[in-house]
């Protein structure tokens, strides 16, 4: 028997492959076969294509035909047209490329033709009949990639065998698509096997590298072993990773099973599944998931605090009624006066002190201190009353610095020490009041907005910190956070902002400017139109005094009655924010065209400012980010905190702002 | 021009075997499959099978396998078929035919030439 | 298998007449039919192949129509020569030739 009609065979390039199957098979019966296989009957569109087929087929008898994928219904004839009425079975007409046996006839087209093409010579395409039963068929299958074909080795047996998705077994291939298996042969009688799979970095690539057929011993590159190779008694060597690795299913190479691990927070080689999940203090793990972590209500715990507590994820504050401030140690209170502002003030970094260095504080405040930048013809809202208590607000970080960001005055004064809120990045925590201490440097007026310091150091993917969401149980109704939760996308590139979607996450790719998507919100009228923005700067966060219902997942609006607006004039595209509010249509912001997004320089000079993530690394190699609220999918989630509009807040003239107090306060985050 | 020339008439005893063959000439012989054909009398047309000279390839009628086969000898470019235990209802005419490949840029399995036929009578 | 059945068997008809021979395939051919005329003592020669198409050398006074189970052949002016037996074959299911059963043409 001849080898052309004994077996298919393939031939593939980086990108397709075409197959021939000699099997006999009518049109209809080809274009089913190609399709359960996952490909299509072969469309060689252009010469390059064509040229491949032709090495496929090779110099076959005359007497041979094969279907590729062209058909034409009943008078349908356009025979002035390259493919002369005939379409692809891809459903277009588009070639750049044909090779009719004949030229076009003036026949009056009555019946359904198809397209065959002869085994021999020329390869030239045929019409004929669908319903024939010709001798085979040849199919396409189009793919990511492709893996080239493995190289000979010294102790190899043979050469490699390879098996494609489309079930083709051959040694005889230049590529192999995705998905193929290759199986080699040694001498000394183990084989392997490899994949050829997705590469992390991008492309495709066998599984595992080689030498695929190791010598006798270690001494060759190690035996093919990543970390370390033991010399067996009967020659053959076998691969052991270092403490904290466990072997990879090449059985060559390690991996950190931490580097995969479903972690909310900490990560931790070892155990049965290779690995342990922990929770920080403040957390403990979830009862249905133990992946996952859960705040710890410290407020539930009798006497926590001597008057008043609030909970919020990862920590809790106490506080004290009016007319009583808390003492040193954060539970007590005592009668206002018998304590000190400045005591008030240091509570933090005496009781609380996470050794940072106070230097480096004060240089982060200096970098701080003059970053503001005037925004002229801006109508900014200020809150109804100025506040008549102090604030300590402290963020907490496992990190050596703690970025900080400008907390707007309040829309309410309560009559409390209020609770601080933790801070990150992705969370723009602008629901509550604060008072500047005298150690650190006043707000502007009402006419310079600030710039929200937002350069943060480099993570891995694996290490990136979603959101930690602030709850406030004690509080009333009215005075809790609306959640709006915004997609992040997981890493941004260099010289990149964050990329920010209310949809779609990591859907921008390197070096393109990130768009916020048009959000509509049901009820309010309000619609958030953000240009694109250029790689050297950060998004902007608008924030618009309407009040709003807290159902509005999609949408970028964060409400509020008296937060500041960091934009800085630019000549960048118009950004256009509106809000109408049924209940206050006063509220409407219109911000000019020459308004655009911020620059947002860093409150940590030590840092590289190419990279715009989350500004916390966990101290545990293999810790990860608390994700709250938690949703399944690729990314961590930007989750905005904002808070509910007084009712009867109007629009003035904006007075002086604050910053939040600059001290460590929970070492729950360590 | 193309032309398939037949083995002259045989007369055969039942039980007995008979091989008939089929000289092509005026084109390449192993571009073209052979097929074989019976004509009873009174009987239409029936298909008993084929051979591809290029590879040997051969597919018979269900209804003759076993008893029928069919070969070639490409140096020759002779076709050969062979028919064993004859009984009297193989009495027929059996051409030899050409199917075609393809007419004016067209595929089609027809046969275009035929051998002039050859009478074969099984009889006691 | 698939059969096919030619109507009618026999045919009178005079020089210059419009002849028609039709075909019928017990399952759907698409357009895998050929006609062949056998005069007596010879062998079969291609008239019609793929239904429609008319085979090198063949007058023009044949035609053939039809696809899927219904198939005709046309004799548009009946000439002394074409007195013969015609077949129809089908081939779909190739290579299982089926013919049928034949049409006689004689001359009134």
């Known amino acids: 028997q001849d080898p052309w009609a004994a077996e298919p065979r393939a031939a593939c390039g980086p990108s397709s492959c075409y197959a021939l199957f000699p099997r006999r098979r009518t049109f209809l019966e080809a274009w089913r076969a190609c399709r359960e296989l996952g490909g299509d009957l072969a469309t060689p569109r252009t010469p390059e294509e064509a040229q491949r087929v032709d090495s496929l087929v090779g110099a076959g008898p005359a007497s041979r035909l094969l279907w590729i994928g062209l058909q034409r219904q009943a008078r349908q004839c356009q025979l002035q047209r390259p493919l002369r009425g005939f379409t692809w079975t891809t459903g277009d007409q588009d070639t750049a490329f044909t090779n009719w046996a004949q030229p076009a006839s003036g026949g009056p087209c009555p019946a359904q033709r198809c397209v065959a093409l002869e085994a021999s010579g020329e390869h030239r395409w045929l019409e004929g009949s669908c319903t024939l039963a010709v001798d085979g068929y040849l199919c396409q299958f189009g793919f990511e990639g492709a893996c080239p074909a493995l190289q000979d080795e010294a102790g190899q047996a043979g050469p490699a065998v390879y098996t494609t998705p489309f079930h083709l077994v051959s040694t005889e291939f230049e590529w192999l698509p995705f998905g193929s298996v290759a199986a080699v042969q040694c001498q000394a009688g183990r084989g392997a096997s490899l994949l050829c799979v997705k590469q992390p970095e991008g492309g495709v690539g066998w599984s595992r590298a080689g030498p695929l057929c190791l010598g006798t011993g270690c001494s060759p590159d190690n035996g093919g072993c990543e970390h370390e190779c033991v010399e067996e008694v009967d020659g053959h060597v076998s691969c052991r990773c270092t403490e904290g690795f466990r072997l990879a299913a090449d059985g060559r190479s390690c991996e950190d099973p931490c580097a995969q691990a479903p972690c909310e927070q900490q990560c931790e080689p070892g155990g049965p599944q290779g690995y342990s999940c922990h929770c920080r203090l403040g957390f403990r793990p979830a009862e249905d998931d133990p992946h996952r972590c859960v705040d710890t209500d410290e407020c539930q715990i009798a006497g926590v605090c001597q008057q008043m507590c609030v909970n919020y994820v990862g920590g809790f504050e106490c506080y004290c009624s009016e007319g009583h401030e808390l003492e040193a140690d954060g539970i007590s209170c005592s009668p206002a006066g018998a304590m000190g502002a400045q005591a008030s003030q240091d509570l933090g970094d005496e009781l609380l002190d996470d050794g940072e260095d106070e230097e480096d504080e004060d240089e982060a405040w200096k970098a701080f201190n003059g970053g503001w930048t005037e925004m002229p013809g801006i109508l900014w809202m200020e809150p109804t009353q100025p506040p008549d208590f102090a604030l300590a607000y402290r963020p907490s970080f496992p990190e050596d610095r703690e970025p900080q960001i400008p907390y707007p005055e309040p829309t309410w004064p309560p009559p409390l020490s209020a609770p601080r809120v933790p801070y990150h990045s992705s969370v723009l925590s602008v629901t509550r009041p604060v008072v500047v201490s005298a150690t650190h440097p006043t707000l502007p007026s009402a006419h310079q907005p600030p710039v929200i310091p937002a350069t943060h150091p480099a993570l891995s993917r694996d290490h990136q910190i979603p959101v930690i969401a602030a709850n406030y149980p004690d509080l009333p109704s009215a005075y809790q956070p609306g959640i709006l939760s915004v997609s992040h996308s997981a890493q941004p590139p260099a010289h990149q902002p964050p990329m920010i979607s209310t949809k779609y996450p990591e859907l921008f790719p390197a070096h393109q400017s990130p768009m916020f998507p048009d959000t509509r919100v049901a009820g309010t009228q309000t619609t958030t139109h953000l240009p694109g923005i250029p790689p050297n700067h950060a998004p902007l966060v608008t924030t618009l005094g309407a009040q709003l219902p807290p159902q509005a997942p999609d949408a970028l609006v964060l409400r509020t009655q008296a937060t500041q607006l960091p934009i800085i004039p630019t000549a960048q595209p118009s950004l256009t924010t509106t809000s109408r509010s049924p209940v206050s249509p006063a509220h409407q912001i219109s911000v000019p065209a020459a308004t655009q997004p911020a620059a947002l320089p860093t409150l940590l000079p030590s840092q590289s400012p190419t990279n715009q993530t989350s500004p916390i690394s966990p101290t545990h190699p293999h810790s990860k980010a608390p994700q709250i609220p938690r949703e399944d999918g690729p990314s961590p989630k930007l989750a905005l905190w904002l808070p509910s509009p007084a009712p009867t807040a109007a629009p003035t003239a904006l007075g002086e702002a604050g910053l939040a107090e600059h001290s460590q306060r929970d070492d729950r985050w360590l | 021009q193309v032309q398939l020339v037949q083995s002259g008439p045989e007369v055969k005893k039942p039980g007995a075997s008979v091989k008939l063959s089929c000289k092509a000439s005026g084109y390449t012989f192993t571009d073209y499959v052979i097929h074989w054909v019976k004509q009873a009398p009174g009987q239409r047309l029936e298909w008993m099978g084929y051979i591809n000279p290029y590879d040997d390839d051969t597919t018979y009628n269900q209804k003759f396998k076993g008893q029928v086969t069919i070969t070639v000898d490409t140096s020759a470019s002779t076709a050969y078929m062979e028919l064993n235990s004859l009984r009297s209802e193989d009495t027929a005419v059996y051409y030899c035919?050409?199917?075609?490949?393809?007419?004016?840029?067209?595929?089609?399995?027809?046969?275009?030439?035929w051998g002039q036929g050859t009478l074969v009578t099984v009889s006691s | 298998d698939i059969q096919l059945t030619q109507s009618p068997s026999f045919l009178s008809a005079s020089v210059g007449d419009r002849v028609t021979i039709t075909c019928r395939a017990s399952?759907?051919?698409?357009?895998?039919v050929a006609w062949y005329q056998q005069k007596p003592g010879k062998a079969p020669k291609l008239l019609i192949y793929s239904a429609s198409n008319r085979y090198t050398g063949v007058p023009s006074r044949f035609s053939g129509s039809g696809s899927g189970t219904e198939f005709t052949l046309t004799i548009s002016s009946m000439q002394p020569e074409d007195l013969a037996t015609y077949f129809c074959?089908?081939?779909?299911?190739?290579?299982?030739?089926?013919f049928g059963q034949g049409t006689k043409l004689e001359i009134k």
């Open positions: 399952q759907n051919v698409g357009t895998a």
């Open positions: 074959q089908q081939y779909t299911n190739y290579p299982m030739y089926t």
């Open positions: 035919a050409r199917r075609g490949n393809s007419y004016d840029g067209y595929f089609d399995y027809s046969m275009d030439y």
